[in-house]
Interface confidence: medium
């Protein structure tokens, strides 16, 4: 039996994946639980098995098709249920009518690369992954640079308020190792949130030219 409060949160990656986390305060025995997706206007439905990520939370990914296939639209509503097995029966533990394009979280940007690096600046580009064509250019980015002796949390956020898949970092220190990350968010969706941060890209600025003796 399950007691306590339950939280069920899901995000759509805009293409073919709904990721869900279910948290349950009360004690849950070693029970098999599933997320079941039932679209209102599609002929498919889908389940995924919730696997523990901590003592009181479970997660799974509803894989709706090939990674770049557009499986849902702005008009879809998907009924999402958490069902847990109790003997031979399944008990509904949580339910929500999920509007995918109101609950977006894109995949982290990929293919980060240094386009050009100098002593004091560095030009970096990246690509977005599995993002719907529906967004056109309606995306924004946040970026951060890790300087020596600092943590990611201390790094100031740079905001790009348009779909710009490059950045020129300036006022860098010569001959210094940095790391760079970027994340993306669609402008659409009441509950939309930032993607995970990209994998960090390490780069080093060029050394300053040696001064000539006078």
């Amino acid at each position: 039996a399950v007691n306590g409060t339950s939280q069920f949160t899901c995000f759509y990656n805009s293409r073919a994946n709904i990721s869900c986390v279910w948290s349950q305060d009360g004690a849950l025995q070693d029970t098999s639980c599933q997320v079941h997706a039932w679209p209102d206007r599609r002929r498919w439905n889908q389940t995924c098995e919730l696997l523990p990520v901590s003592q009181a939370s479970w997660a799974c990914n509803l894989i709706l098709g090939a990674p770049d296939s557009q499986k849902l639209t702005t008009v879809d509503i998907v009924t999402l249920r958490v069902l847990c097995r109790e003997g031979v029966r399944w008990r509904v533990m949580a339910i929500q009518d999920f509007k995918p394009f109101e609950n977006l979280r894109l995949m982290a940007p990929i293919s980060l690369q240094v386009v050009h690096v100098e002593t004091h600046r560095c030009n970096i580009s990246w690509e977005i992954s599995q993002a719907s064509h529906y967004f056109e250019r309606h995306l924004e980015f946040e970026a951060r640079t890790l300087s020596p002796g600092h943590t990611w949390e201390e790094a100031p956020l740079l905001t790009l308020k348009q779909k710009q898949e490059w950045i020129c970092l300036e006022t860098l220190t010569p001959d210094t190792q940095y790391e760079f990350q970027v994340r993306v968010k669609p402008l659409q969706g009441e509950f939309t949130t930032w993607s995970p941060w990209s994998q960090p890209l390490a780069f080093r600025t060029k050394p300053a030219a040696l001064g000539k003796d006078t």
Partner: nanobody
Framework: QVQLVESGGGLVQAGGSLRLSCVVS????????MAWFRQAPGKEREFVAA????????EYVDSVKGRFTVSRDNAKNTVYLQMNNLKPEDTAVYYC????????????????WGQGTQVTVSS
């Protein structure tokens, strides 16, 4: 459209073992709960075993519990049925089935099917 191809069937003496394999192609394998069914001559096709998308949860018909083990290798797009201590009553054509909905996998109606592999257990 997903395609399923079974292999590993054959003739075996009672008490022996066989391992059936089913390779899945044409779609993203981890979308699917996988199952094995069997059909003996003159009988309905019956559910034998199923394994969820992650491979963590399995279920079996009572008559094979403790003798059969279903498993999957998501890297190889393959589901297996290890059959030990086989009995003459296990003789049947064994079918691999796939369904994106775990809750319908026991139903014969909405699954994708392989062509089947014959298992014959002699006494």
């Amino acid at each position: 459209q997903v395609q399923l191809v079974e292999s590993g069937g054959g003739l075996v003496q009672a008490g022996g073992s066989l391992r059936l394999s089913c390779v899945v192609s044409g779609d993203v394998f981890v979308r699917y709960t996988m199952a094995w069914f069997r059909q003996a001559p003159g009988k309905e096709r019956e559910f034998v075993a199923a394994v969820t998308d992650s491979g963590r949860t399995t279920e079996y018909v009572d008559s094979v519990k403790g003798r059969f083990t279903v498993s999957r290798d998501n890297a190889k797009n393959t589901v297996y049925l290890q059959m030990n201590n086989l009995k003459p009553e296990d003789t049947a054509v064994y079918y691999c089935a796939a369904n994106t909905d775990y809750f319908q996998i026991r139903s014969v109606d909405n699954n994708a099917w392989g062509q089947g592999t014959q298992v014959t257990v002699s006494s």
